[in-house]
Interface confidence: low
Amino acid sequence: DYKDDDDKGWVWNQFFVPEEMNTTSHHVGRLRSDLDNGNNSFQYKLLGAGAGSIFVIDERTGDIYAIQKLDREERSLYTLRAQVIDSTTGRAVEPESEFVIRVSDINDNEPKFLDEPYEAIVPEMSPEGTLVIQVTATDADDPASGNNARLLYSLLQGQPYFSIEPTTGVIRISSKMDRELQDEYWVIIQAKDMIGLPGALSGTTSVLIKLSDVNDNKPIFKERLYRLTVSESAPTGTSIGRIMAYDNDIGENAEMDYSIEDDSQTFDIITNNETQEGIVILKKKVDFEHQNHYLIRANVKNRHVAEHLMEYHVEASTTFVRVQVEDEDEPPVFLLPYYLFEILEESPHGSFVGMVSATDPDQRKSPIRYSITRSKVFSIDDNGTIITTNPLDREISAWYNLSITATEKYNVQQISAVPVYVQVLNINDHAPEFSEYYDSYVCENAGSGQVIQTISAVDRDESVEDHHFYFNLSVEDTKNSSFIIIDNEDNTAVILTNRTGFSLQEEPVFYISVLIADNGIPSLTSTNTLTIHICDCDDYGSTQTCRDKDLLLSMGFRTE
């Protein structure tokens, strides 16, 4: 029995009511004053929350009853107050006292997983014992009441890959898993209370365990040989085709780099980061006529491989790529970048100038036709032979710049042009001449040996070395000449008087024939007339007045 703190005489046991009792009234216990002698003069009263509604008291005996079903998980204790009154006097026999009724637990709640849904990610190929996730169930029953809330965890689905620690709910890997075979697992966990004893309640939950990828697969070419084609006209940088390796991994672990093991001079491979295809790129132009196919060896490796996964990537996958070069109809090609020919001037019509040659670089060698653009002087035949169609005069044109085109007979769209330079070589076809018109004057009283005129000559011919001119008087003039010529041997000559005194009245003008020869082979000679006027000179022997008079006459003035 229990006496209250004040030791005033209240006597009661600890009160417990089992929850979920189905009886209409359940005896909880009895309140009693030790002053009660059983003559029914005492009256017991119950006060506080629940008094009268949940709990009632037999006023005569102090017996307390629960008249409603209780749920410990809703409320586990009730605090009430007790009074005892002497019914004869109406006065309290004992001071009012507080007491507690506890609701005792029964196992009426199953374990619940409150944190659902569970999802965990763990790397594939993780070793046994790797922690995946901890699941925790909650049981609303009283943990202090027997085993009602003592839980044990077990695996209903998930063996042999996973295991669970029975008391902690920690899920661990019990067998290595390969994401490439299966990438997610549904594990079903059961939590049982009563530590699994009979009458236990249970709850289940599902855990979705996803395997994250590790780079345990290297990329592999599915094909031993890929066939690609490229036109010989394709510029460098052209994408000529794709090759593909397959990697069972995903994301970053499936990123790959392609490379060419050989002939990296002509081709390259880049990775398309979106599709992970290898794009074969032309690095250097190809020529069908030089090489019509290539066999290249390509390999592929993952871009990111951790050190501890290197064992999976020891040997890179390789494949062959056969690149067929497609023939493209190419224009003719001249043997030389330009041609230089020489021909003598005055060569007759139809003279051979030179020969050009172009060939079709394609396999199907097309015959070539030649033509000269806009030339009246030269023509070309289908053999590339250039001939003259008119005589050439170096003094009119010393050089001809021609453009010769070569056209494929089978495809007139294929045209090439080459510059041809024709130099017209000099022949000695011009005699030297006076370089200017000479009008000379001599005084009547001139003495013998007097220099009258210095003459020079020009020659329109081109000379390989310097021109050399030879000056002479004509045979007639030499016989009876009043004048002589002296060759200075520097392409000039001087005319001198060969007598003393001249007569203006008798012979006012002399016409001297000067022969000028060049040093060409054969030498050419011209006859040039030198006019010498006889003057009535002043005392000083000046021919100026004579010259002035000639000038006036030439202008139409008379002189006396």
Partner: antibody, heavy 120, light 111 residues
């Protein structure tokens, strides 16, 4: 143009086997996979399996595993599909279809089909 | 039942636009190319669309294909009477390690 020519119609009794041929021409036979697809009367298309003629590698649909055998003869550019333990539900038109250079690439050319009737 | 789901029938009048859908999963449409085949009555199937959206030569540009996630669709614009046929989607399935076809959609051109 690629051509796939299949053998003629067959009538078989339940429990027997049938071997359908598919002769390929006008392409490099050894470069492409060949699949077999069947179509029961009034039904959809059903993939049976695939063979790579150069190495003879095969992959069969789970449903036909153990009953179907696919072979290739590179000398005649012909693939064969043999289906054993025939039952009435195997009555269908059987097509060969040229695949790509990868298992997972589309079928671009189809044979004209071979009707196999299984009846007692 | 098929791994790929197609509605069994579709219809439209000449000139209309019709869309046929094909639904799959991550292991097939989600990670591989989708192809579409047209089967005219009494003939072998014919490739209509390959690698999601490419048309073989000879297929009019009225036919177009697209893919998003684990679904694909075939659109036919300017519908013509000769388009009346069965249409099948097909794709490689990584999990099954084999090809799978949709159940087929019968397209009827009305009027």
């Amino acid at each position: 143009q690629v051509q796939l020519v299949q053998s003629g119609a067959e009538v078989k009794k339940p429990g027997a086997s049938v071997k359908v041929s598919c002769k390929a021409s006008r392409y490099t036979f050894t470069s492409y996979y060949m699949s077999w697809v069947r179509q029961a009367p009034g039904q959809g298309l059903e993939w049976m399996g695939i063979i790579h003629p150069s190495g003879g590698d095969t992959t069969y649909a789970q449903k036909f595993q153990g009953r179907v055998t696919m072979t290739g003869d590179t000398s005649t550019s012909t693939v064969y599909m043999e289906l054993s333990s025939l039952r009435s539900e195997d009555t269908a038109v059987y097509y060969c279809a040229r695949g790509g250079i990868k298992l997972w690439l589309h079928f671009d050319y189809w044979g004209q089909g071979t009707l196999v009737t299984v009846s007692s | 039942h098929s791994v790929l789901t197609q509605s069994p029938s579709a219809s439209g009048t000449p000139g209309q636009r019709v869309t046929i859908s094909c639904s799959g999963s991550r292991s097939n449409i989600g990670s591989n190319f989708v192809n579409w085949y047209q089967q005219l009555p009494g003939t072998a199937p014919k490739l209509l669309i390959y690698t999601n959206n490419q048309r073989p030569s000879g297929v009019p540009d009225r036919f177009s294909g697209s893919k998003s996630g684990t679904s694909a669709s075939l659109a036919i614009s300017g519908l013509q009477s000769e388009d009346e046929a069965d249409y099948y989607c097909a794709v490689w399935d990584d999990s099954l390690n084999g090809w799978v076809f949709g159940g087929g959609t019968k397209l009827t051109v009305l009027g």
